[in-house]
Amino acid sequence: EEELQMIQPEKLLLVTVGKTATLHCTVTSLLPVGPVLWFRGVGPGRELIYNQKEGHFPRVTTVSDLTKRNNMDFSIRISSITPADVGTYYCVKFRKGSPENVEFKSGPGTEMALGAKPS
């Protein structure tokens, strides 16, 4: 049986204020059943960055087409980067539960940091 892997290839992503950042995440299996969400930080205080199923995330867009079948690319773009956006971002697979989904596996995380302003 293929074990699900959450792949976040960049450990560090240097970004520029005002620009768009792309955070990559791919998975190796569609299983277990359940959604993938993006968070910044870990633990109970982590911040939800993107949930495709519900919520309003005006600065976030998906890299892959949302009508694509059997999608394994859960990468996102965050526009208009500000200093408040720095931190470590995790894509997290949840296992479908009733009534609550249960966290199943997290990617290793991508640290977003500010790079030097272009001169």
Partner: antibody
Framework: DVQLVESGGGVVRPGESLRLSCAAS????????MSWVRQAPGEGLEWVST??????YYADSVKGRFTISRDNSKNTLYLQMNSLRAEDTAVYYC???????????????WGLGTLVTVSS | EIVLTQSPATLSVSPGERVTLSCRAS??????IAWYQQKPGQAPRLLIY???SRDTGIPARFSGSGSGTDFTLTISSLQSEDFGVYYC??????????FGGGTKVEIK
């Protein structure tokens, strides 16, 4: 080409058991969820059960009586049906799940079905 | 459990006519609706997913629309091979997956 072939249907008495199988080919079986959907004679479609990896989901009408399982080494889906009732009489379809977007499952390929008749 | 209500139950139409089938959900399901066609003695066949995306190989005369609670499957010009029963299915909130009761499209 994706192919799903059900077997194991037949006529049983109330209270008896039956095991359905679904042989899958033409796709990477182990990475997809699989489901059973049934259709009573002259009636509409009713979802029965879905299996992911080892995560399983059941309709209330079969919970505790039916068990869904899979053998990825054999590309086969199973439905063990115990304590069968007259109202379980139906054609049972095996279906491959497909996702769209970041979650949400529907059924993109179906087998031809196998008929289960529960009658005394 | 989300209930899907399809209307009409039966539709008598002639080949070449435009056909509109309705599916109403008991609560908001966003665009998480699929449509299937089933001919007598055959398995269901996926037509539309995500409310409006045609499955591979489905003719352009089939189209889906709607979001929230009201959905429509349209056949722009009915062909003889389109007769059968059409079902909608929601996958927004499950278990259970639920299907509508079906609309039978028959020859006038």
């Amino acid at each position: 080409d994706v192919q799903l072939v059900e077997s194991g249907g037949g006529v049983v008495r109330p209270g008896e058991s039956l095991r359905l199988s679904c042989a899958a080919s033409g796709f990477s079986f182990s990475i997809y969820a699989m489901s059973w959907v049934r259709q009573a004679p002259g009636e509409g479609l009713e979802w029965v059960s879905t299996i992911g990896a080892d995560d399983t989901y059941y309709a209330d009408s079969v919970k505790g009586r039916f068990t869904i399982s899979r053998d990825n080494s054999k590309n086969t889906l199973y439905l063990q049906m115990n304590s069968l009732r007259a109202e379980d009489t139906a054609v049972y379809y095996c279906a491959k799940d497909s996702t769209v977007g970041w979650s949400g499952d529907f059924f993109d390929y179906w087998g031809l079905g196998t008929l289960v008749t529960v009658s005394s | 459990e989300i209930v899907l209500t399809q209307s009409p139950a039966t539709l008598s139409v002639s080949p070449g006519e435009r056909v509109t089938l309705s599916c109403r959900a008991s609560q908001n399901v966003r665009s998480d609706i699929a449509w299937y066609q089933q001919k007598p003695g055959q398995a269901p066949r996926l037509l539309i997913y995500a409310a409006s995306s045609r499955d591979t190989g489905i003719p352009a005369r089939f189209s889906g629309s709607g979001s929230g609670t009201d959905f429509t499957l349209t056949i722009s010009s009915l062909q003889s091979e389109d007769f059968g029963v059409y079902y909608c299915q929601q996958y927004y909130d499950w278990p259970p997956f639920t299907f509508g009761g079906g609309t039978k499209v028959e020859i006038k």
